[in-house]
């Protein structure tokens, strides 16, 4: 079945009067960018920049677009078929066990360790023991133990954004 392009799929400046276009479901499902009507007879388009759906679905409502927190940058905006993509600002990263916030990367490794990996939006700097080459996954070292890899004081272990 051919993809249905509705007014809601267009950028806001391209849209005419606000009006949710409808089409018919295919085997009880509506295409990405739409949700199903209460009676199951229509597919109603999501609202551009407000909500979305990514798959063929029988959802009564489209999903709300994510809004990037302060401390995050928007890599790509929300469309009717794709959620917003947010990324931690430079110098911060998001851990798997605390995905709700970006934490500041450490500025250096503890004494006796060398940096083998840079700060990325997904990971802190990576440190290994000079001799053994084993990774260090401990807490941020005390100031006097830190060997900074750049000027300035070590970062605090946690930075709450938003």
């Amino acid at each position: 079945e051919s993809a249905l392009i509705t007014q809601q799929d267009l950028a806001p400046q391209q849209r005419a009067a606000p009006q949710q276009k409808r089409s018919s479901p295919s085997e009880g499902l509506c295409p990405p960018g739409h949700h199903i009507s209460e009676d199951g007879r229509d597919c109603i388009s999501c609202k551009y920049g407000q909500d979305y759906s990514t798959h063929w679905n029988d959802l009564l409502f489209c999903l709300r677009c994510t809004r990037c927190d302060s401390g995050e940058v928007e890599l790509s905006p929300c469309t009717t078929t794709r959620n917003t993509v947010c990324q931690c600002e430079e110098g911060t990263f998001r851990e798997e066990d605390s995905p709700e916030m970006c934490r500041k990367c450490r500025t250096g490794c503890p004494r006796g360790m060398v940096k083998v990996g840079d700060c990325t939006p997904w990971s802190d700097i990576e440190c290994v023991h000079k001799e053994s080459g084993t990774k260090h996954s401990g807490e941020v070292p005390a100031v006097e133990e830190t060997v900074t890899s750049s000027p300035g004081t070590p970062a605090s272990p946690c930075s709450l954004s938003g």
Epitope: H35, G40, N57, D58, L59, L60, F61, C62, L63, T66
Partner: nanobody
Framework: QVQLQESGGGSVQAGGSLTLSCAAS????????VGWFRQAPGKEREFVAA????????VYAYIVKGRFTISRDNAGNTVSLRMSSLEPEDTAVYYC????????????????????WGQGTQVTVSS
Amino acid sequence: QVQLQESGGGSVQAGGSLTLSCAASGRAASDYAVGWFRQAPGKEREFVAACNWSGEDTVYAYIVKGRFTISRDNAGNTVSLRMSSLEPEDTAVYYCAAAPSFSRSVLDGNLSQIDYWGQGTQVTVSS
């Protein structure tokens, strides 16, 4: 985690009105669709009404359409269910529930998709 707390239940005469409230708290609570469900003694829990994250889109069970109205405050953290022309058959424990959205199968009693439930509030309608 999203926490849901219902209030406003009570006893009322047939033909009367009652307004239930559901207070949603927790990270991104206002991003969720919220629905009201009810369970009468000896019966399955059933869908009553739901609204999307903004409160702009609403859906009702056929049996309550025209009598019940679901609404959401601007902050998105309180969802109300205004019930009028109440009948003894409306007697049940009313539950608030939240999910990113609800599948249409929820209208037929498929509740597996729901992420969060409140504790419920009792509504009794006497004739």
